[in-house]
Amino acid sequence: EAHKSEIAHRYNDLGEQHFKGLVLIAFSQYLQKCSYDEHAKLVQEVTDFAKTCVADESAANCDKSLHTLFGDKLCAIPNLRENYGELADCCTKQEPERNECFLQHKDDNPSLPPFERPEAEAMCTSFKENPTTFMGHYLHEVARRHPYFYAPELLYYAEQYNEILTQCCAEADKESCLTPKLDGVKEKALVSSVRQRMKCSSMQKFGERAFKAWAVARLSQTFPNADFAEITKLATDLTKVNKECCHGDLLECADDRAELAKYMCENQATISSKLQTCCDKPLLKKAHCLSEVEHDTMPADLPAIAADFVEDQEVCKNYAEAKDVFLGTFLYEYSRRHPDYSVSLLLRLAKKYEATLEKCCAEANPPACYGTVLAEFQPLVEEPKNLVKTNCDLYEKLGEYGFQNAILVRYTQKAPQVSTPTLVEAARNLGRVGTKCCTLPEDQRLPCVEDYLSAILNRVCLLHEKTPVSEHVTKCCSGSLVERRPCFSALTVDETYVPKEFKAETFTFHSDICTLPEKEKQIKKQTALAELVKHKPKATAEQLKTVMDDFAQFLDTCCKAADKDTCFSTEGPNLVTRCKDALA
């Protein structure tokens, strides 16, 4: 229903704490360079204004849209052009163009320093002094680095953070309590970020229909006992929630997500038998829990999919009658039978089925033409299954770091023009799929591997879009979202690439590497590995292994030496010479 004052409506629905958190996230995602204090000031002003509208919905400006109110706030920031350049031009536009302009200027890779976690004592001190400000800083720092982070989920992670600090800051050994717990939250939040970015990409590039198809497949896998009307309702509502969040309408998004959670909990009987535990939790935990709830038990007596979609004499009539509904029903029926498939694979199968009907229903004898469609799915299913087997075998043999290195070599050969930091980041993320998915039961591996890889490759595409350098990457990124992963997997060595000349300074290291944390050391070594491949794209695995082993030995020796600097300056050039010889 329409409200006199949108801002008062959202404030009342969300409550002050969530309202302020969401406004802070929104501002931090739009203006990524502003300091926390600048944003906190704006948030307070917006909140004070919302309260005046709650008291009197007819007060001045209370009837304005949220985009107008928030946009006016952002455009009033001093030195906007100096700090943000052409983003300031957005302020010359009217809504809704102004908001669209802000969205287009969101930067997926902002030049901000990595978010460093303070040491435990300092963290606990500032948390105890002012928990609200402390959590505000967390929301601000995450949101500005991840401008498409799913806002209500970020509130959930902040709540997790808060609970961990409350618990650990009361312990004697704060450090050993905080580190593993906060690392766990960070890992989950980073995965959440790339997954949500993929959803926004789907929405931005291919529209609501594409996202809704993704949602139908995913929900049908999770809720195989729900009927198609129920799945359609959930998918429609979920599409609206994600559209709002991807579009920067964070208050509406969070409000509608809470409504969806409420609906699901009130209609468990028609959705799933697995929801009760989630539904007993408070709002943020409830919505998070529902988003990753375990799959319900599949109905025992599901008929073969062929009955309705191949053997039925009226397939073409039913398809022509309501194409989207018929294809939606197919996707629903196939997905509920296959929780062991990735959503990407299910969407590829639905696309294949649609193409088959389009072709066959125009022919003289359609049943003879589409009769083999399910058999034609086989190669599409085998390809990702083989990918999972090959990669999980390799992961089990090499471990995470070795597996990342194997992927780094593979992807540097596929797209050597891509910047080394991007290749290293991508390979490290892709390599984590082993730890994340290969340890799961067999029937959960494929959905875990492929849907995670797709999300990571989406980030590769977004970064590459900013500065396109590789025709291979452009080709894979410009196709449909579900075809990206198979496209990247099929890429081979880029034969058009002219190898980089060997620069000794690229492979020159200093004693400061010895004191770096293990993760940073790995990144340095992986940077060197990518540069080696760029120098010798056709180097064999054996050659690269020889060089990397030599490099690791060199680091080990020099970092243990009494005079590290001398060791690095004398042994370093020898290492460079040996590398050149090994790769000659």
């Epitope: 009927d227 009307a229 129920e230 359609t232 209609n267 028609t270 309705d308 009226e314 309501a322 509904v325």
Partner: nanobody, 118 residues
């Protein structure tokens, strides 16, 4: 095009029974959730009952629970509503509805009038 044709309405005494039928055409009946909606004189539309495509799950409004039974025969493209222990407040036009999505319906028939009166 989609057609829904209700029948079986009429005048009945309180405590009596009626069976409504709805014959569907123009769409794949077995793929859709179907239901009955009613409108009492001077009132808004109210969901009475709905049934899943495969007939495995049924929903009833609190006001009719235990008295009404919905069923379907997918081979005949027909939906039924068995109404027992009828009361004066059940007087309404009953519409057969095709539901494309939970809590929404996109097509309904012309309706059949049920009058419960002594």
């Amino acid at each position: 095009e989609v057609q829904l044709l209700e029948s079986g309405g009429g005048l009945v005494q309180p405590g009596g029974s009626l069976r409504l039928s709805c014959t569907a055409s123009g769409f794949t009946f077995r793929h859709y959730r179907m239901g009955w909606v009613r409108q009492a004189p001077g009132k808004g539309l109210e969901w009475v009952s709905w049934i899943r495509p495969d007939g495995t799950f049924t929903y009833y409004a609190d006001s009719v629970k235990g008295r009404f039974t919905i069923s379907r025969d997918n081979s005949k493209n027909t939906l039924y509503l068995q109404m027992n222990s009828l009361r004066a407040e059940d007087t309404a036009v009953y519409y057969c509805a095709k539901s494309y999505m939970a809590d929404r319906f996109d097509y309904w028939g012309q309706g059949t009038l049920v009058t419960v009166s002594s």
